[in-house]
């Protein structure tokens, strides 16, 4: 079960970073309804995070890398949470 | 322009929430980061929010401090204050903190 | 976390002249070039300059230039002004950000 949450978050992740490089940023994600905010980041009042845009004007590696990884860690809370939720739903039944 | 507010005379062991605005650019479309100077001293980078929601923070800060977003603000809190926390805060924008607001001071002291 | 380990202060300079600001940190910054230089006058708050090494930053004069590679870095203030007197400080980003670490400063003085 892990190899494959593992597989999911590493071609959600791949997807993510084809679509960062087109300019596209979440929007697809959030249609497939992988949005939501993380817990522990922003409030209840925070806007959806996929309503949110890029990080400014820099283009250079290090932007681009930390922009990558913040990617990847949404993506990976997003999911565990997902899986999370599932084994609890699992476990009521 | 970006603005912080919050920072006040606190004693030892208080927590604290800075906060964070901005005006003339969407706060939610930036990445954000907060350093802190204490008086007389160099920069001291604390950590930063992705647009994602995300957190990275300097290995010194040991959980003590936390940041999070919401659309129109970011927000540092702080706990486990000792007088060693006592300096001016910064927020600023982006990655390579390209803008900066005018700090707001936190004085720990019994 | 990473150390930044700047030129000693004060660096002296006369108006015309020419000033060097050295930055050695104690690992690779990311992709060799993860260094900004910010300056800051008292009371104020810092100002970038130059990022990924050696890009000027948005509205920031041509006299500054920046240089290096991997651990050393370089600022270089070319026909230094009576306005440049000010602390500099560089900033390294790393593959771990918790290591990210501003180095100690260096003030000029413009005689």
């Known amino acids: 079960r892990r190899d494959v949450a593992h597989g999911i978050l590493n071609e959600a992740y791949r997807k993510v970073l084809d679509q960062l490089s087109a300019g596209k940023h979440l929007q697809s994600l959030v249609a497939r309804g992988v949005g939501g905010s993380l817990g522990g980041g922003a409030g209840d009042d925070a806007e959806p995070l996929s309503k949110r845009h890029s990080d400014g004007i820099f283009t250079d590696s290090y932007s681009r890398y930390r922009k990558q990884m913040a990617v990847k860690k949404y993506l990976a809370a997003v999911l565990g949470k997902r899986y999370k939720q599932r084994v609890k739903n699992k476990g009521r039944r | 322009s970006v603005e912080e507010s919050g920072g006040r005379l606190v004693t030892p062991g208080t927590p604290l929430t800075l906060t964070c605005t901005a005006s003339?650019?969407?706060?939610?479309?930036?990445?954000m980061g907060w350093v802190r100077q204490a008086p007389g001293k160099g920069l001291e980078w604390i950590g930063d929010?992705?647009?994602?929601?995300t957190t990275d923070y300097a290995s010194w800060v040991y959980g003590r401090f936390t940041i999070s977003r919401t659309s129109t603000t970011v927000t540092l809190k702080m706990t486990s204050l000792t007088t060693e926390d006592t300096a001016t805060y910064f927020c600023a924008r982006d990655y390579w903190l390209s803008l900066w607001g005018q700090g707001t001071l936190v004085t720990v002291s019994s | 976390a990473a150390v930044l380990t700047q030129t000693p202060s004060p660096v002296s300079a006369a108006v015309g002249g020419t000033v060097t600001i050295k930055c050695q940190s104690s690992?690779?910054?990311?992709?060799?070039?993860?260094l900004a230089w910010y300056q800051q006058k008292p009371g104020q708050p810092p100002k970038l300059l130059i990022y990924?090494?050696?890009t000027l930053a948005s509205g920031v004069p041509s006299r500054f230039s920046g240089s290096g590679s991997g651990t050393e870095f370089t600022l270089t203030i070319s026909g230094v002004q009576c306005d440049d007197a000010a602390t500099y400080y560089c900033?390294?980003?790393?593959?771990?950000?918790?290591?990210?670490?501003f180095g100690g400063g260096t003030e000029v003085v413009v005689k």
């Open positions: 690992q690779s910054v990311y992709d060799n070039n993860a």
């Open positions: 003339g650019f969407s706060l939610s479309s930036y990445a």
């Open positions: 929010i992705s647009t994602y929601g």
């Open positions: 900033l390294g980003g790393y593959y771990d950000p918790a290591d990210n670490a």
């Open positions: 990924a090494a050696s």
